[in-house]
């Protein structure tokens, strides 16, 4: 790497992937292994992120960009840049400090992450329950009872209500 020629700041000409080495008369030196600089003119190289444990490498570190991680199967990313991995649960469950727990009656979770949310209250919108909710699915709201006058398009009545199984919290 040639010595920089800038009269203002000799480090300003050091390209990404290098650093301005004060110990070597401000020569542009390549970033050492496991480090990078994403912009020019840097006086130090950043440390590459390591994707280990529950993290796995989505993009390798290079001399000009940091590594990117995602999570191993059974875990999902939390936060921008996948700063943490959180254990997956099944649909119909939520993650607590004691592990995955079934959603309480009246709540559901249709994903492998996140918390159990209350079923929609159809009556608030003046509608009726068309399909009952489960641990995994929200209720489906149908037309309001007034809309179901004789002669109107028939709606197959829902199956008898059955409380989804749930374990005590």
């Amino acid at each position: 790497f040639e010595r920089t020629r800038s009269l203002q700041d000799p480090c300003s000409n050091c390209p990404a992937g290098t650093f301005c080495d004060n110990n070597r008369n401000q020569i542009c030196s390549p970033c050492p292994p496991n480090s990078f600089s994403s912009a020019g003119g840097q006086r130090t190289c950043d440390i590459c992120r390591q994707c280990k444990g529950v993290f796995r490498t989505r993009k390798e570190c290079s001399s000009t960009s940091n590594a990117e991680c995602d999570c191993t199967p059974g875990f999902h990313c939390l936060g921008a840049g996948c700063s943490m991995c959180e254990q997956d649960c099944k649909q119909g469950q939520e993650l607590t400090k004691k592990g995955c727990k079934d959603c309480c009656f009246g709540t559901f979770n249709d994903q492998k992450r996140g918390i159990c949310r209350p079923w929609t209250n159809c009556s608030l919108d003046g509608k009726s329950v068309l399909v009952n909710g489960t641990k995994e699915r929200d209720v489906v709201c149908g037309p309001s009872p007034a809309d179901l006058s004789p002669g109107a398009s028939s709606v197959t009545p829902p199956a008898p209500a059955r409380e989804p199984g749930h374990s005590p919290q």
């Epitope: 130090t44 992120r49 444990g53 936060g79 700063s83």
Partner: antibody, heavy 118, light 112 residues
Framework: SLEEAGGDLVKPGASLTLTCTAS?????????MCWVRQAPGKGLEWIAC????????TYYANWAKGRFTISKTSSTTVTLQMTSLTAADTATYFC????????????WGQGTLVTVSS | ALVMTQTPASVSAAVGGTVTINCQAS??????LAWYQQKPGQPPKLLIF???DLASGVPSRFSGSGSGTQFTLTISGVQCDDAATYYC??????????????FGGGTEVVVK
């Protein structure tokens, strides 16, 4: 580079906000920006970090929870709010940058001195 | 909480000699360990990261080793400029409620 500001002489029980300003880079590249302090003649003590990505996740040493608050206030500024200060909080407060996710700080500010005395 | 125990608290070495500083973590931190050099009136300077990787601009006479709970910083061919206090630091981000990050107590290196 990183530059800390806001250090001052304050009385016990007072509050103070320190500012760390980045130059030559911005938080558009995601880093962990952290605060570390050093009491006169003593060792280094980690206080808190904030992830500058959109999640803005914050992390605190157990002893710092409740009394210290770290925030990202712009694309180049991080603050540390300190409340109920005591003489034990007298220290030089450093701002530091981590790109590794493992508390390895390759860039430090020069520090700002906070003195708590009546 | 993670605790980093550094030994010795102080060590003296002749120019050209070798200095070894040890750091013990209270729990397994894999290779998530850094070493810093600090001189009076200055901020710390990163020397070693991931237990054994040399930071940019750091002379090769500095080296690090270890993993798990036991780590070592070695300065081979000590120079006068190496007189400083050295700190180890270990840790990792888990969650906001369970975060591990700690510095060792420091080792003062005196060069004769």
């Amino acid at each position: 580079s990183l530059e800390e500001a806001g250090g001052d002489l304050v009385k016990p029980g007072a509050s103070l906000t320190l500012t760390c300003t980045a130059s030559g880079f911005s938080f558009t590249s995601s880093y962990y920006m952290c605060w570390v302090r050093q009491a006169p003649g003593k060792g280094l003590e980690w206080i808190a970090c904030i992830y500058t990505g959109s999640s803005g996740s914050t992390y605190y040493a157990n002893w710092a929870k409740g009394r210290f608050t770290i925030s990202k206030t712009s694309s180049t500024t991080v603050t540390l709010q300190m409340t109920s200060l005591t003489a034990a909080d007298t220290a030089t407060y450093f701002c530091a940058r981590d790109s590794s996710s493992y508390y390895m700080f390759n860039l430090w500010g020069q520090g700002t001195l906070v003195t708590v005395s009546s | 909480a993670l605790v980093m125990t550094q030994t010795p608290a102080s060590v003296s070495a002749a120019v050209g000699g070798t200095v070894t500083i040890n750091c013990q973590a209270s729990e397994d931190i894999d290779n998530y360990l850094a070493w810093y050099q600090q001189k009076p009136g200055q901020p710390p300077k990163l020397l070693i990261f991931y237990a054994s990787d040399l930071a940019s601009g750091v002379p090769s006479r500095f080296s690090g080793s270890g993993s798990g709970t036991q780590f070592t910083l070695t300065i081979s061919g000590v120079q006068c400029d190496d007189a400083a206090t050295y700190y180890c630091q270990g840790g990792y981000y888990t969650s906001s409620t369970d975060t591990r990050g700690a510095f060792g107590g420091g080792t003062e290196v005196v060069v004769k």
